[in-house]
């Protein structure tokens, strides 16, 4: 449900579906790249799966010398720290033999810092966003996305990895946070709650949304995820809140309609290529940005988070499908897969628009307590 204060013209108000900003329906790919000798000349390899650490499953990108890289999926397991009143109690732990990083879970033992010391870092994610305290930064220009429109073939891999549903993205999806801040999309995944319980990771003035999408990107300055982990700006995540609206979201339906096929943990299916950008809000100019971490172990810091001001609207039925279809390990439902919000510890969240200006009649004077730091530094 939307809070009464979430108005169309206020921060984080207004979904991107309906007449205002329809989410265009497209397709989604995942056979990955082409063959070469075992993969034809000049083509890319199909991603192979290997277990390594990271937020959701971070793909590994080949060095540039090996052509525009294809992705190797590494199961970067996930767990979350307790502490949020709505934190899940019983789900989404990983259980892989011989892997010390496998016993993750949301809201239970082991404590995350024991799994990865970085999880006890000072600049962690997610955080609570307080628009009134955000620093308006005019230097934050509209995000640029290129190559996010994909034909139906090759298909894309959609997987229930036990802690989220993840879509592996092919090479060539380029995103720029600004001049010289260029990234390539690797994968996207979702976080959600349970019936009547919201499950976004970030919150706004303490308000938790029904769900949240994360599109994970690797800086073009790095060839591999493991090189970028912990490096400032090495990874960037685009995040958008999902909330309930009156109509079915056709872009999301292309994924949600396939969830029954991957209800079991570790199962996967192939979905036709689609317009990945249609899963995001249409307004790329209004967003919040801060430096944080992966929200799952290894909780590596230096991640640039961009949280859209505009939300994405899904129907009640679609939100129910998302939160009530997948299963984690054992007999536990895959639900409430979000981490508790973490302290800012002095960090200032920047806004690309004057988010601190309250448009309601109550605000006589605009309040903007923090000033903008130089963007792109």
């Amino acid at each position: 449900q939307r809070l009464p204060r979430m108005q169309e013209d206020s921060p984080l108000g207004g979904g991107s579906s309906g007449e205002d900003d329809p989410l265009g329906e497209e397709d989604l790919p995942s056979e990955e790249d082409s063959p070469r000798e075992e993969d034809p000349p000049g083509e890319e390899d199909l991603p192979g799966e290997e277990d390594l650490p990271g937020e959701e499953d971070l793909p590994e990108v080949k060095p540039k010398s090996e052509e525009e890289g294809s992705l190797k999926l590494e199961d970067l397991p996930t767990v979350e720290a307790p502490g949020d009143p709505q934190e899940p109690q019983n789900n989404a732990h990983r259980d892989k033999e011989g892997d010390d990083q496998s016993h993750w879970r949301y809201g239970g033992d082991p404590p995350w810092p024991r799994v990865s010391p970085a999880c006890a870092g000072r600049f962690q994610s997610p955080v609570d966003i307080r628009p009134q305290l955000a620093a308006f930064c005019p230097a934050l220009r509209p995000l640029e996305l290129l190559g996010f429109q994909l034909p139906p073939l090759p298909e894309l891999r959609l997987r229930n990895n036990g802690h989220s549903v993840q879509l592996t993205l092919p090479p060539g999806l380029e995103m720029a946070l600004g001049p010289g801040r260029e990234y390539r999309a690797l994968q996207l995944h979702l976080h959600w709650g349970a019936a009547g319980r919201p499950g976004s990771e970030h919150t706004v003035e303490g308000h938790r949304f029904p769900a949240e999408i994360h599109v994970v990107h690797l800086s073009t300055a790095f060839a591999r995820v493991d090189e970028a982990l912990g490096r400032p700006g090495g990874l960037a995540v685009l995040a958008a809140f999902l909330e309930e609206g009156p109509e079915e979201n056709s872009a999301y339906e292309q994924l949600l309609s396939r969830l029954e096929e991957i209800a079991e943990e570790g199962s996967e299916t192939q979905v036709p290529g689609l317009d990945i950008s249609a899963l995001l809000p249409s307004d790329f100019s209004r967003y919040f940005q801060y430096e944080g971490s992966l929200t799952t172990p290894p909780c590596a810091q230096g991640v640039i988070w961009t949280v859209f001001n505009q939300t994405v609207m899904l129907s009640a039925k679609q939100l129910h499908t998302l939160s009530d279809t997948l299963w984690g390990p054992g007999d536990s439902r895959l639900q409430l897969n979000f981490r508790a919000t973490q302290p800012l510890n002095g960090r200032v969240i920047e806004a690309s628009f004057p988010a601190g200006v309250d448009s309601s009649p109550r605000a006589a004077e605009p309040v903007q307590l923090n000033s903008c730091l130089a963007a792109g530094d």
Epitope: P35, R36, E38, P154
Partner: antibody
Framework: EVQLVQSGGGLVQPGGSLRLSCAAS????????MSWVRQAPGKGLEWVSA????????YYADSVKGRFTISRDNSKNTLYLQMNSLRAEDTAVYYC????????????WGQGTTVTVSS | QSVLTQPPSVSGAPGQRVTISCTGS?????????VHWYQQLPGTAPRLLIY???NRPSGVPDRFSGSKSGTSASLAITGLQAEDETDYFC???????????FGGGTKVTVL
């Protein structure tokens, strides 16, 4: 060596049927989407049909919908195109092509096989 | 009539630069779908020359380059050589037709 070797072309009367085959080698055939593309004499290229890696999804050009059927046997590394109710305008060189390229390009092509529909 | 429009022919002297245009619409190139280019020598199958608007498969000389803007794309050949005299096709995907689409082809002549 990565290659696609085609067979099955020939002369057929209008209304007749023909089955084209495309045998793949040198790469993991079952991991890639495949297509058929044709070229009428002296003309340009026209996409005909496509099939996903596992064979679960198929796509057809409007000009052949309901008459042609694409299929694959991943255990035999072979792609097929069953052509029924053939018309004179189906006369062309038919190419099988791998469209597993991540951006939708056709990166590996068969040598082509000629289909002539004439009475 | 092809969905993507190419000039029937272009020509240039050896060593010169020639460009081939490929014009589409809001349901293919303009919708954000990538453009790919193929070279077809007489009597042979097409060969992928440029994929993803501006990427060259290994083995393709760097004399060939691609670009895309709005609803059109172009292929540039610099340092034109005699062996470049052949046919070139652009290709994309069209969401309205739900089909992979090609241009009509351009014959490059080396003077």
């Amino acid at each position: 060596e990565v290659q696609l070797v085609q067979s099955g072309g020939g002369l057929v009367q209008p209304g007749g049927s023909l089955r084209l085959s495309c045998a793949a080698s040198g790469f993991t055939f079952s991991s890639y989407a495949m297509s058929w593309v044709r070229q009428a004499p002296g003309k340009g290229l026209e996409w005909v049909s496509a099939i996903s890696a596992n064979g679960g999804t198929t796509y057809y050009a409007d000009s052949v919908k309901g008459r042609f059927t694409i299929s694959r046997d991943n255990s035999k590394n072979t792609l097929y195109l069953q052509m029924n109710s053939l018309r004179a305008e189906d006369t062309a060189v038919y190419y099988c092509a791998n469209n597993g390229n991540y951006r939708g390009a056709f990166d590996i092509w068969g040598q082509g096989t000629t289909v002539t529909v004439s009475s | 009539q092809s969905v993507l429009t190419q000039p029937p022919s272009v020509s240039g002297a050896p060593g010169q630069r020639v460009t081939i245009s490929c014009t589409g619409s809001s349901s293919n190139i303009g919708a954000g779908f990538d453009v790919h280019w193929y070279q077809q020598l007489p009597g042979t199958a097409p060969r992928l020359l440029i994929y993803g608007n501006n990427n060259r498969p290994s083995g393709v000389p760097d004399r060939f380059s691609g670009s895309k803007s709005g609803t059109s794309a172009s292929l540039a050949i610099t340092g034109l050589q005699a062996e470049d005299e052949t046919d070139y096709f652009c290709q994309s995907y069209d969401s309205s037709l739900s089909a992979w689409v090609f241009g009509g082809g351009t014959k490059v002549t080396v003077l």
